[in-house]
């Protein structure tokens, strides 16, 4: 069971300092941006991190949304990352959900975060280069020190 708590506005970056944004095709991508680029591209660079209470504590449970024309929420259905046009629900009556990730700091580095899927144990949000694009993907990872699954989250509230 997950019960919705408070939300915060955040900018998410990979460890190469590229900024996560949602492009016109609703794809989550990373790109080099100055602070002014980041502001100019809002709200596509501003993510709503919705925190949830977890009936079996496993870290901070979050859903990640973005509000452009409508609210879209990050999903890892079938292990594929996409933004679905939906509001994060107030309650989820299950211990797993495609929109819930566990946000945890990397041990010894409170400013570096990992996001593990609640649906797929051992699968993490990751940044991966595909041709000329840096994409947000879900990746099965057994190298937990790999920088591709680490992010910084800057609160904008």
């Amino acid at each position: 069971y997950f019960g919705k708590l408070e939300s915060k506005l955040s900018i998410i970056r990979n460890l190469n300092d590229q900024v996560l944004f949602i492009d016109q095709g609703n794809r989550p991508l990373f790109e080099d941006m100055t602070d002014s680029d980041c502001r100019d591209n809002a709200p596509r660079t501003i993510f709503i991190i919705n925190m949830y209470k977890d009936s079996q504590p496993r870290g901070m449970a979050v859903a990640i949304s973005v509000k452009c024309e409508k609210i879209s929420t990050l999903s890892c259905e079938n292990r594929i990352i996409s933004f679905k046009e939906m509001n994060p629900p107030d309650n989820i009556k299950d211990t797993k959900s495609d929109i819930i990730f566990f946000q945890r700091s990397v041990p010894g580095h409170d400013n570096k975060m990992q996001f593990e899927s609640s649906s797929y144990e051992g699968y993490f949000l990751a940044c991966e280069k595909e041709r000329d694009l840096y994409k947000l993907i879900l990746k099965k990872k057994d190298e937990l020190g790999d920088r591709s699954i680490m992010f910084t989250v800057q609160n904008e509230d």
């Epitope: 945890r104 144990e121 099965k140 937990l144 020190g145």
Partner: antibody
Framework: QVQLVQSGAEVKKPGASVKVSCKVS????????FHWVRRRPGKGLEWMGR????????KYAERFKDRVTMTEDTSTDTAYMELSSLRSEDTAVYYC???????????????????WGQGTLVTVSS | DIQMTQSPSSVSASVGDRVTITCLAS??????LTWYQQKPGKAPKLLIY???KLQDGVPSRFSGSGSGTDFTLTISSLQPEDFATYYC?????????FGQGTKLEIK
């Protein structure tokens, strides 16, 4: 309690190949990997590589990548490690081990080698 | 590759002694470090994971500490069954690498 049972000792000639098996018995959760580690006489532990039973993807240590093949048969819950072009320096005890997630009190994951096979002595001698 | 430098390579001690073994990583491995004990003719046994978390069933005289690049395994009061070889292992990135091992012998 998971147990790993390995095949018996082998004596091989230089240039030959050896295939060691590792059978899982007991209840094992999903999301684990098989790793292979060896210990040569008078030396320390040495990581050789791993296989993911979910998709058969492998990662090998650079020094073995041209000679080692790791496979897994999900139907029999058995992992295999084949080492080719054997030389005397490959004389060692070879271990299979499971690599899976343990968690701390906040749910943070750590991979560990928890269950180990009993080891298989491979002797390479002409 | 990440190098793990373990020291000392051997140590002689008596029952009741406090023994410390160190492992130094060549780069930041966070706390993705495990410690193993191996006795002759036996498979390694997990003692500590996450640098400082005691595996179930392991006596509390064993403890681990450290983060980043410097790690320590401490046995607070040696017991006869503790004489063995100890290894650290970094699990941060492939290839996984072990320390060279520390042989703990009876003085």
């Amino acid at each position: 309690q998971v147990q790993l049972v390995q095949s018996g000792a082998e004596v091989k000639k230089p240039g030959a190949s050896v295939k060691v098996s590792c059978k899982v018995s007991g209840e094992i959760s999903t999301g684990y990997y098989f790793h292979w580690v060896r210990r040569r006489p008078g030396k320390g532990l040495e990581w050789m590589g791993r296989i993911d039973p979910e998709d058969d993807s492998t990662k090998y240590a650079e020094r073995f990548k041209d000679r080692v093949t790791m496979t897994e048969d999900t139907s029999t819950d058995t992992a295999y490690m084949e080492l080719s072009s054997l030389r005397s320096e490959d004389t060692a005890v070879y271990y299979c081990t499971t690599w899976r997630i343990y968690r701390d009190s906040s749910g943070r994951p750590f991979y560990v080698m928890d269950a180990w096979g009993q080891g298989t002595l491979v002797t390479v001698s002409s | 590759d990440i190098q793990m430098t373990q020291s000392p390579s051997s140590v002689s001690a008596s029952v009741g002694d406090r023994v410390t073994i160190t492992c130094l990583a060549s780069e930041d491995i966070y706390t993705y470090l495990t410690w193993y004990q191996q006795k002759p003719g036996k498979a390694p046994k997990l003692l500590i994971y996450g640098a400082n978390k005691l595996q179930d069933g392991v006596p509390s005289r064993f403890s681990g500490s450290g983060s980043g690049t410097d790690f320590t395994l401490t046995i607070s009061s040696l017991q006869p069954e503790d004489f063995a070889t100890y290894y650290c292992l970094q699990g941060s990135k492939f290839p996984l690498t072990f320390g060279q091992g520390t042989k703990l012998e009876i003085k």
